[in-house]
């Protein structure tokens, strides 16, 4: 059965300077391949976080993603700024062989509203 990516919150509001959690769960880790978070859609979308070992300032995973059966790919964004406003998508990829990874499923998106302090 096809993997499903769930982002339960349609939107979240956070005060500038605070932190917020963006929730994402998947129903399967197969086919093998990374899960990444993006802001925006299309060609201009911005990679926000990838669960592939790299360091991303201000962002960290919420659950222990080193568990081999982990299905929770939620992230915490710290010290939120107005520039962080936008819609965030949790995306499951299938690893490519000699080509780039292939996007196979995206969550419905979570809109982040940043409120003035």
């Amino acid at each position: 059965t096809e993997v499903k990516v769930t982002q339960p919150e349609k939107s979240v509001s956070v005060a500038a300077g605070d932190s917020t959690i963006l929730n994402c769960t998947v129903t399967s880790l197969l086919p093998v391949g990374p899960i990444r978070w993006y802001r925006g859609v299309g060609q201009s979308r911005l990679l926000i976080y990838s669960f592939t070992g790299e360091h991303f300032p201000r962002i960290r995973n919420v659950s222990d993603t080193t568990k081999r059966n982990n299905m929770d790919f939620s992230i915490r964004i710290s010290n939120v700024t107005p520039e962080d406003a936008g819609t965030y998508y949790c995306v499951k990829f299938q690893r490519g062989s000699s080509e780039p990874d292939t996007e196979i499923q995206s969550g419905g998106g979570t809109e982040v509203y940043v409120l003035a302090k």
């Epitope: 197969l30 070992g53 222990d64 568990k67 690893r95």
Partner: antibody, heavy 118, light 108 residues
Framework: DVQLVESGGGVVRPGESLRLSCAAS????????MSWVRQAPGKGLEWLAG????????YYIDSVKGRFTISRDNPKNSLYLQMSSLTAEDTAVYYC???????????WGLGTLVTVSS | SYELTQPPSVSVSPGQTARITCSGG??????YAWYQQKPGQAPVTVIH???KRPSDIPERFSGSSSGTTVTLTISGVQAEDEADYYC???????????FGGGTKLTVL
Amino acid sequence: DVQLVESGGGVVRPGESLRLSCAASGFTFSSYAMSWVRQAPGKGLEWLAGISAGGSDTYYIDSVKGRFTISRDNPKNSLYLQMSSLTAEDTAVYYCARETWNHLFDYWGLGTLVTVSS
Amino acid sequence: SYELTQPPSVSVSPGQTARITCSGGDYYSTYYAWYQQKPGQAPVTVIHSDDKRPSDIPERFSGSSSGTTVTLTISGVQAEDEADYYCGGYDGRTYINTFGGGTKLTVL
């Protein structure tokens, strides 16, 4: 620099127990899953067990389930392998290895030799 | 569970290209890596995540995959590359790691 140093190997008799340790340095130990791999003399590599970064989840190859226990102490940057009911077939060099995000291995210790002999 | 199959030995002249294959995994659920081991030494990771090379590994080492077969390619082989090479796999279906039997690379 990432460093993994195993200790605790030695000569034991069949049926006895042994506890191996792996001291980690040069990286944030509590952020990485870890594994134990062994290599019998003149043979290939055999994965034995893995443990999640937080230590709550463990995984074993069927042949050592119930006999070997993997654990970790994150404040001490240490990984352990408790082995019991040892047999001659457990004679090998035991390596600890750091896992990548997808549970392959990127760094290995130098190994510690366990000899089970009467 | 699955088995990874490698040729027992591969021979190549210095400067030539060596290719070591590994088959038997399920591409849908398995990630692959390659580990180099010289006599009396610990393994060293030369490729992980199918084709990712650690920063301290020479560029002549590369990994690729096609279907259920993965390949370690060593371009411009040097005498120091003589070693045993193990294919390793992680199966996301069973949560188990597996190694191939190893391939002895001889530089003629």
